[in-house]
């Protein structure tokens, strides 16, 4: 990740807004504060981004390297099967879930995990870099 404004000014990757980080063609925002899943989704949408939808194992692995033990909301929900917010199924990883009332997805350095959607967690937004 090119951690432009979080750790250093990085002239080679100026294309993400302040406090966002660049990886490939995308910018990522890792929140410090905590919100429920819906509020996290709304935060991202208001910034022309979406709650993190992970495209493949490589991206997931890279993001997990950056994360701590703390869970962060991602754009994953259980609507008759685990699906990303764009409707695509979760197919490159499993989500740890054995409760039928935990229907929102979160990620930390170790795993994808189901949680009750009203729990306040940090979150990750993602958008295409300019």
């Amino acid at each position: 990740l090119c951690q432009g404004s979080k750790y250093s000014t990085c002239a080679s990757c100026p294309s993400c807004p302040d406090h966002w980080m660049k990886y490939g063609n995308h910018c990522y925002y890792f929140s410090v504060e905590k919100k429920d899943w819906i509020s996290s989704l709304e935060f991202c949408l208001a910034r022309d981004s979406h709650l993190l939808m992970i495209t493949d194992k490589q991206e997931m692995s890279l993001l997990q390297d950056f994360l701590s033990e703390a869970f962060h909301w991602v754009g994953l929900r259980n609507n008759s099967g685990w699906r990303w917010e764009d409707g695509s199924p979760l197919n490159f990883s499993r989500i740890y879930s054995n409760s039928l009332v935990q229907t929102c997805g979160a990620i930390n350095k170790n795993s994808l995990q189901a949680s009750s959607c009203e729990v306040s967690l940090q979150w990750v937004c993602k958008k295409v870099s300019p």
């Epitope: 429920d36 054995n98 039928l100 009332v101 935990q102 995990q113 949680s115 009750s116 009203e118 729990v119």
Partner: antibody, heavy 125, light 112 residues
Framework: QVILKESGPGLVKPTQTLTLTCTFS??????????IGWIRQPPGKALEWLAH???????SYNSALKSRLTISKDTSKNQVVLTMTNMDPVDTATYYC?????????????????WGQGTTVTVSS | DILMTQSPLSLPVTPGEPASISCRSS???????????LEWYLQKPGQSPRLLIY???NRFSGVPDRFSGSGSGTDFTLKISRVEAEDVGVYYC?????????FGAGTKLELK
């Protein structure tokens, strides 16, 4: 699948301490959002929540019984233990453990999706 | 503590007929997060309770659609559209919105 099973002494004398064990499988009590609660039911009466414990070791107790209750977990054995001191005949009941789900408040919970079959405890001299 | 008052305490019903159980809380049980953690459990004779409805109106997995929950604030209702023999048992309402979590006294549904 998720299974919970309670075990206990069956018969306890007044003033003695009751120790109950809930042994579970099908999930881990180290997993974010998971908890186990204890609920009791005196013969022919309603259900009463006693205590619960969360994955992060946070605990909550029924305030009326708090001074008598201790809940703990042993994640390596997949067990939760409830102790209740100074037992009295009015504590005669079936004691259940149930898995609880976190929604943001450590002091309470929702959705007891899975219950044990219960263990009967009689308090009598 | 929040008192959960159920009525009736006993409910004889003819198979195929509807049934309705009321649960009233002594104070509003909407949580500060906007959700209402009101649940219904059925305890069949000789068995442990099992979850039927959570968050007022959400049917738990495997629960037949003849069961429905409704209500808000302090007044809640469990309805069975057509009672079947397997529905016999004691129905409990439960609130987890406020500390301590509390159960109602139960409603015993029996067949006429």
């Amino acid at each position: 699948q998720v299974i919970l099973k309670e075990s206990g002494p069956g018969l306890v004398k007044p003033t003695q301490t009751l120790t109950l064990t809930c042994t579970f499988s099908g999930f881990s009590l180290t997993t974010f959002g998971m908890g186990i609660g204890w609920i009791r039911q005196p013969p022919g009466k309603a259900l009463e929540w006693l205590a619960h414990i969360w994955w992060n070791d946070d605990k909550s107790y029924n305030s009326a019984l708090k001074s008598r209750l201790t809940i703990s977990k042993d994640t390596s054995k997949n067990q939760v233990v409830l102790t209740m001191t100074n037992m009295d005949p009015v504590d005669t009941a079936t004691y259940y453990c149930a898995r609880t789900i976190y929604y943001g408040n450590y002091l309470t919970f929702y959705a007891m999706e899975h219950w044990g079959q219960g263990t009967t405890v009689t308090v009598s001299s | 503590d929040i008192l959960m008052t159920q009525s009736p305490l006993s409910l004889p019903v003819t198979p195929g007929e509807p049934a309705s159980i009321s649960c009233r809380s002594s104070q509003n049980i909407v949580h500060s997060n906007g959700n209402t953690y009101l649940e219904w459990y059925l305890q069949k004779p000789g068995q442990s309770p099992r979850l039927l409805i959570y968050k007022v109106s959400n049917r738990f997995s495997g629960v037949p659609d003849r069961f429905s929950g409704s209500g808000s604030g302090t007044d809640f209702t469990l309805k069975i559209s057509r009672v079947e023999a397997e529905d016999v048992g004691v129905y409990y309402c439960f609130q987890g919105s406020h500390v301590p979590p509390t159960f109602g006294a139960g409603t015993k549904l029996e067949l006429k």
